[in-house]
Amino acid sequence: LQDPCSNCPAGTFCDNNRNQICSPCPPNSFSSAGGQRTCDICRQCKGVFRTRKECSSTSNAECDCTPGFHCLGAGCSMCEQDCKQGQELTKKGCKDCCFGTFNDQKRGICRPWTNCSLDGKSVLVNGTKERDVVCGPSPADLSPGASSVTPPAPAREPGHSPQ
């Protein structure tokens, strides 16, 4: 015998209290597949979350984050605070990158400047809290007559700036 509930389409549930009649999902609930015996409660997007897609009888609501925060996790399960470029997020809030590190995004951690000398290159543009150093040609390429550009002073050794 075929289960009568298998005939209930998405957006309905098989109501055991009414002789397994297919009943529409109540407000603020949904069923995304047929043959369901219950409807699922719609996700509520509130506070740090905002609604990206409204709940319908056949699909759950989708949330993103209120401006000032960004999504983390599958389906935007969490919202995390944005910081400014040149900062990283800590439990104490947004903090400036330490000297010798940078972050060019509103999220993520401060990363060390590229060490140009490891590639046998010189520093063409010094790094900042927001930008990595730009490595230039190797010092050997800058022999007299090879270029009229005066190489800048090398960047200071990374150290911690006061917070």
Epitope: G47, V48, F69, L72, G73, S77, M78, C79, E80, Q81, L89, T90, K91
Partner: nanobody
Framework: QVQLQESGGGLVQPGGSLRLSCAAT?????NYWMNWVRQAPGKGLEW???????????YYVDSVKGRFTISRDNAKNSLYLQMSSLRAEDTAVYFC????????????????SGQGTTVTVSS
């Protein structure tokens, strides 16, 4: 169902005080970092303060340091924000929000928040 419900907002004069409360239901508050965030009219969301599970660590955005105090009563499953020396720029909707699993280790994401309570500072 996991829920947070804020209360205690209202109209207050500059220099005045308010105490916001947040009641947690459907989960054990003592297992989570908790946060207050706010949204001023026409602005983005701003993190205000957080507190760790047992209340031994508390951190604040610079603009409220020395004026706001975050606290919690795990026995009552409640979070609080005592606000004093209020300024016009503190006018906002205030939300309490739970730190998600792994908060402070892998991320600083918030996974549950309430509907908010409105604080208006005006003479």
């Amino acid at each position: 169902q996991v829920q947070l419900q804020e209360s205690g907002g209202g109209l207050v004069q500059p220099g005045g005080s308010l105490r916001l409360s947040c009641a947690a239901t459907g989960f054990t508050l003592s297992n989570y970092w908790m946060n207050w965030v706010r949204q001023a009219p026409g602005k983005g969301l701003e993190w205000v303060a957080n507190i760790n599970q047992d209340g031994s660590e508390r951190y604040y955005v610079d603009s409220v340091k020395g004026r706001f105090t975050i606290s919690r009563d795990n026995a009552k499953n409640s979070l609080y924000l005592q606000m004093s020396s209020l300024r016009a720029e503190d006018t906002a909707v205030y939300f309490c929000a739970r730190g998600g699993e792994g908060y402070g280790v892998d991320h600083y994401g918030l996974d549950v928040s309430g509907q908010g309570t409105t604080v208006t500072v005006s003479s």
